[in-house]
Interface confidence: medium
């Protein structure tokens, strides 16, 4: 129903706390360089204005759209052009073009320093002094680094953060209480960020239809007892929620997500038997819980998929008269039978089925032509299954760090033109798939591995889009979203690449590396490894292992030495010489 004042409506629906949090996220995602204080001031002004509209919906400007109100606020920021360059040109446009312009200027890789966590005592002091400001800082810092973070989910992570601090700041050993818990939240939030970015990419590049297909497959796997009408309704609603969040309409997105959670909890009987635990929780926890609820038990008496989609004499009629609906039914039926497949794989199978019908229904004897379609799925299914087996075996053999290094070598050979920091970030993220997925039961591995890899590769594509340097990467990133992972997997050594000349300074290290945290040390070593591969793209695994072992031993020796600086300055050049010889 239409409301006289959109801002009053959203304030009333969401409540002040969530309203303020979402406005802060929205501003931080649009203008990523502004300080917390600048954004906090704008948020307060918007909130005060919303309250005047709640009191009187007919008050001046209360009838304006949220885009108009927020855009006007952002465009009134002093020194916008100095700080943001051409983003300031957006302010010369009218809505809806102005909002589209802001969206196009979101930066997936802003040049901001890493978000450093203060030490426990300092954190607890500032949290106790002003919990609201502390959480505001958290929302601001995460949102500006992740401009497509799913806003209602970020409120959930802030709530988690709040609960952890409340608990741990009361402990004697704050540090050992906080560190593992906050590390856990950070890891989950980072995965949530790349997953959501993938959804927004799907929406931006391929439209709502592509996202809805993803949602149908995912929901059918999770709720195999829900019928197609129910799945379609949920997929339509979920598409709307994601479209709003990806489009910067965060208040509408959070409000509609709450509505969807409410609907699911009121209709558990027709959706799933597994929802009750989630539905007993408060709003943010409820919606988060529903988004990762375990799969319902599959109905025992599902007929073979062939009955409806291969053996039936009306297949071509069904397809011709309502293509999308018929293919949607196929995707639903196949997905509910295969919780053990990745969504990407299910979408590839649906695409193959569609292509087969397109071809066969134009022929003289369609049933004879499409009769073998299910058998033709086999290679499409085997490929990711083999990928999972090979990679999980390798992970189990090498551990996470060794597995990351193997991936780093592989991907540097596939796309040596890509910048080393991007390759290292991608390999570290891709390598985490082992820890995340390979320890799961067999039937959960494939969906976990492939859908996670797809999300990470989406980030690789986004970063590469900014400065395209590799034809291999461009080729894989230009195709459909579901074909990306197989495309990257199939890439081999880039034969067109002219090896980088050997620069001694790239492999020169100083004693400051000894005091770095383990993660930073690993990144330094992995940077050197990528550079080695760029110098010798066809180096064998043995050669690279020799060099890296030598390198690790060198660091270990010099970091234990009494005079570290001397050790680094004398042993360093020897290491460089040995490296060159080993790779010659």
């Amino acid at each position: 129903e239409a409301h006289k004042s959109e801002i009053a409506h959203r304030y009333n629906d969401l409540g002040e706390q969530h309203f303020k949090g979402l406005v802060l996220i929205a501003f931080s995602q649009y203008l990523q360089k502004c300080s917390y204080d600048e954004h906090a001031k704008l948020v307060q002004e918007v909130t005060d204005f919303a309250k005047t509209c709640v009191a009187d919906e007919s008050a001046a400007n209360c009838d304006k759209s949220l885009h108009t109100l927020f855009g006007d606020k952002l465009c009134a920021i002093p020194n916008l052009r100095e700080n943001y360059g051409e983003l300031a040109d957006c302010c010369t446009k009218q809505e809806p073009e102005r909002n589209e312009c802001f969206l196009q200027h979101k930066d997936d890789n802003p040049s901001l320093p890493p978000f450093e966590r203060p030490e426990a005592e300092a954190m607890c002091t500032s949290f106790k002094e002003n919990p609201t400001t502390f959480m505001g800082h958290y929302l601001h810092e995460v949102a500006r680094r992740h401009p497509y973070f799913y806003a209602p989910e970020l409120l959930y992570y802030a709530e988690q953060y709040n609960e952890i601090l409340t608990q741990c700041c009361a402990e004697a050993d704050k540090e050992s209480c906080l560190t593992p818990k906050l590390d856990g939240v950070k890891e989950k939030a980072l995965v949530s960020s790349v997953r959501q970015r993938m959804k927004c990419s799907s929406m931006q590049k391929f439209g709502e239809r592509a996202f809805k297909a993803w949602a149908v497959a995912r929901l059918s796997q999770t709720f195999p007892n829900a019928d197609f009408a129910e799945i379609t309704k949920l997929a339509t609603d979920l598409t709307k929620v994601n479209k709003e969040c990806c489009h910067g309409d965060l208040l509408e997105c959070a409000d509609d997500r709450a509505e969807l959670a409410k609907y699911m909890c009121e209709n558990q009987a027709t959706i799933s038997s597994k929802l009750q635990t989630c539905c007993d929780k408060p709003l943010l926890k409820k919606a988060h819980c529903l988004s990762e609820v375990e799969h319902d038990t599959m109905p025992a008496d599902l007929p073979a998929i062939a009955a409806d989609f291969v053996e039936d004499q009306e297949v071509c009629k069904n397809y011709a008269e309502a293509k999308d609906v018929f293919l949607g039914t196929f995707l639903y039926e196949y997905s509910r039978r295969h919780p053990d497949y990745s969504v990407s794989l299910l979408l590839r199978l649906a695409k193959k089925y569609e292509a087969t019908l397109e071809k066969c229904c134009a022929e003289a004897n369609p049933p004879a032509c499409y009769g073998t379609v299910l058998a033709e799925f086999q290679p499409l299914v085997e490929e990711p299954k083999n990928l999972v087996k090979t990679n999980c075996d390798l992970y189990e053999k090498l551990g996470e760090y060794g597995f990351q290094n193997a991936i780093l070598v592989r991907y540097t050979q596939k796309a040596p033109q890509v910048s080393t920091p991007t390759l290292v970030e991608a390999a570290r993220n891709l390598g985490r798939v082992g820890t995340k997925c390979c320890t799961l039961p067999e039937d959960q591995r494939l969906p976990c591995v492939e859908d996670y890899l797809s999300a990470i590769l989406n980030r690789v594509c986004l970063l590469h889009e900014k400065t395209p340097v590799s034809e291999h990467v461009t080729k894989c990133c230009s195709g459909s979203l579901v074909e990306r992972r197989p495309c990257f997997s199939a890439l081999t050594v880039d034969e067109t690449y002219v090896p980088k000349e050997f620069k001694a300074e790239t492999f020169t290290f100083h004693s400051d590396i000894c005091t770095l945290p383990e993660k930073e040390k690993q990144i330094k070593k992995q940077t050197a490894l990528a550079e080695l591969v760029k110098h010798k793209p066809k180096a064998t695994a043995e050669q690279l292992k020799t060099v890296m072992d030598d390198f690790a031993q060198f660091l270990d020796t010099c970091c234990k030495a009494a005079d570290k600086d001397t050790c680094f300055s004398t042993e360093g050049p020897n290491l460089v010489t040995r490296c060159k010889d080993a790779l010659a």
Epitope: A229, I231, A307, D308, Q313, N318, A322, V325, F326
Partner: nanobody
Framework: EVQLLESGGGLVQPGGSLRLSCAAS????????VAWFRQAPGKGREFVAG????????YYADSVKGRFTISRDNSKNTLYLQMNSLRPEDTAVYYC???????????????????WGQGTLVTVSS
């Protein structure tokens, strides 16, 4: 759950007409693929006509094409079968079956319809 209740059967002379109704409850009929089947004494259930859920695609058995018309009234949540030019071989108990959440009839196989009415008898005889 979908409950179905057929009505409209009876005795009719060859060449005559009848209109069968199937009232549905527990689910909107336009969200459900529904079909009419019939069962003559000593025989299996045979597909007669069907209509898709969400999309009005209709299907007929060859033996009834041009004589029978399937339709539905969403406001009344009811399915109909208009039977004209009836023949003695049309004599049977007529059942309606539903496949909830099916946007299309994609099968003429009775086993794939989980919900059924109790049936209504149609006798064509002079």
């Amino acid at each position: 759950e979908v409950q179905l209740l057929e009505s409209g059967g009876g005795l009719v002379q060859p060449g005559g007409s009848l209109r069968l109704s199937c009232a549905a409850s527990g689910r909107y009929i336009d969200e459900t693929a529904v079909a009419w089947f019939r069962q003559a004494p000593g025989k299996g259930r045979e597909f007669v006509a069907g209509i898709g859920g969400g999309v009005d695609i209709t299907y007929y058995a060859d033996s009834v094409k041009g004589r029978f018309t399937i339709s539905r009234d969403n406001s009344k949540n009811t399915l109909y079968l208009q039977m004209n030019s009836l023949r003695p071989e049309d004599t049977a108990v007529y059942y309606c079956g539903a496949r909830p959440g099916r946007p299309l009839i994609t099968s003429k196989v009775a086993d794939l319809y989980p919900y059924w009415g109790q049936g209504t008898l149609v006798t064509v005889s002079s």
